[in-house]
């Protein structure tokens, strides 16, 4: 809303409000290795970190979300920590038919915000 | 991706896992009573409950924040659950010159996925 | 511009009941909630409820509560005004309004016959 | 319930003269936000009731401006600066600052 200004300094100290982390993962830590052929290794960034009130609320449903959270936080959850735009990756795989290559646009975050 | 099978029946019991939920607020709840002037109540839909593995996965980076946060459970959060889609609701509110009509399209949240 | 289209003239029995519908053409809803009111002949106009978005629980009038039900289902944009347990007093024309909240009752449909008798 | 008062109940009107109706409620329509929730609606003969007046005095899209609001707390009216033979029909007050939402009985407007 026009009355609730998203904050972008964290309060809880450095590195501990939502942002972006890159985690190393092999084939094996995904399951993939049975039909990915390449890369052997991602770096999948993810968003991760806590959610404080009006930090990088996502839209006006997150500020809201906010707000209830302080009122009835049994009963309303904070906002979470999750992407809020991604980066492609081309991954080479087995086919039926042999090997493909396909870009994939939703599996390493390029950026978070809290919703 | 094509070797990840999201699911929709909830382990974890009725009512348990990531679900859109209705919650009632007023203007004063929302701090909104100095500006909208109606509706004076809203139904908050919001998106409420649990993220089990690949439980109403978002998409392919959902499924591997599910895959590494049961490997890592300390460094990889689990998926958490937040709006897939909005309903949009118009506000009739006040403005420096008097009082207008908006249609906010975040604010009310329609459906819920995993993220 | 949005328009509200209801649906045609109905007779009934008394005791049954009778369900009007309300489409939004050219457009859906939109965010805005829908109220219904009847006029009676020759008689001013009376709110029996409304519903706001997400369209989810509605709000009655005490006079009409438990006799009416009203619903929306967005992904056809129409509202429905459903009536049970029909008495001759509720012989009326049923109108469906777009309003924000109760307020401002923008858009109008253009009312539908209910004729209730034995 | 707010029980809505208007008066006259018949208002004979001439061509290009002014006429204004009033409209009472039995209690304070002013909410804690500075607003009136009263708004007016025109019903044609045949048709549909149409906004004219909501919150008490802001005109709705496409009203012209010789329709004006005024008034707070319980006594309103609705003015009309020169009628035209289009404005004839049944005007009713609406109170919207609490359910059950209340109209007023109308007042018909005719051509003398």
């Known amino acids: 809303s026009a009355h609730a200004h998203p904050r972008d300094s964290c309060p809880l100290g450095p590195g501990r409000c939502c942002h972006l982390e890159t985690v190393q993962a092999t084939l094996e830590d995904l399951g993939w290795s049975d039909w990915v052929l390449s890369p052997r290794q991602l770096q999948l960034s993810m968003c991760v970190g806590e959610c404080p009130h009006l930090y990088r609320s996502a839209n006006t449903h997150a500020q809201i979300k906010a707000r209830l959270h302080g009122l009835q936080p049994d009963k309303v959850p904070a906002p979470c920590c999750v992407p809020s735009s991604y980066t492609p990756v081309v991954l080479m795989h087995r086919t039926d038919s042999g090997v493909s290559l396909q870009t994939y646009d939703d599996l390493v975050a390029r950026g978070c915000h809290c919703a | 991706s094509a070797h990840a099978h999201p699911r929709d029946s909830c382990p974890l019991g009725p009512g348990r896992c990531c679900h859109l939920e209705t919650v009632q607020a007023t203007l004063e709840d929302l701090g909104w009573s100095d500006w909208v002037l109606s509706p004076r109540q809203l139904q908050l839909s919001m998106c409420v409950g649990e993220c089990p593995h690949l439980y109403r996965s978002a998409n392919t980076h959902a499924q591997i924040k599910a895959r590494l946060h049961g490997l890592q459970p300390d460094k990889v959060p689990a998926p958490c659950c937040v709006p897939s889609s909005y309903t949009p609701v118009v506000l009739m509110h006040r403005t420096d010159s008097g009082v207008s009509l908006q249609t906010y399209d975040d604010l009310v949240a329609r459906g819920c996925h995993c993220a | 511009q949005v328009q509200l289209v209801q649906s045609g003239a109905e007779v009934k029995k008394p005791g049954s009941s009778v369900k009007v519908s309300c489409k939004a053409s050219g457009g859906t809803f939109q965010g805005y909630a829908i109220s219904w009111a009847r006029q009676a002949p020759g008689q001013g106009l009376e709110w029996m409820g409304g519903i706001i978005p997400p369209y989810a629980t509605a709000n009655y009038a005490q006079k009409f509560q438990g006799r009416v039900t009203i619903t929306a289902d967005e992904s056809t944009s129409t509202a429905y005004m459903e009536l049970s347990s029909l008495r001759s007093e509720d012989t009326a024309v049923y109108y469906c309004a777009r309003g924000v909240g109760e307020l401002h009752l923008d858009v109008w449909g253009q009312g539908t016959m209910v004729t209730v008798s034995s | 319930d707010i029980v809505m008062t208007q008066s006259p109940l018949s208002l004979p009107v001439t061509p290009g003269e002014p006429a204004s109706i009033s409209c009472r409620s039995s209690?304070?329509?002013?909410?804690?936000?500075?607003?009136?929730?009263l708004d007016w609606y025109l019903q044609k003969p045949g048709q549909s009731p149409q906004l004219l007046i909501y919150?008490?005095?802001n005109r709705a899209s496409g009203v012209p401006d010789r329709f004006s609001g005024s008034g707070s707390g319980t006594d309103f009216t609705l003015k009309i600066s020169r009628v035209e033979a289009e404005d004839v029909g049944v005007y009713y007050c609406?109170?919207?600052?609490?359910?059950?939402?209340?109209f007023g009985g109308g007042t018909k407007v005719e051509i003398k």
């Open positions: 919150l008490g005095s």
């Open positions: 609406m109170q919207a600052l609490q359910t059950p939402i209340t």
């Open positions: 209690q304070s329509l002013l909410h804690s936000n500075g607003y009136n929730y």
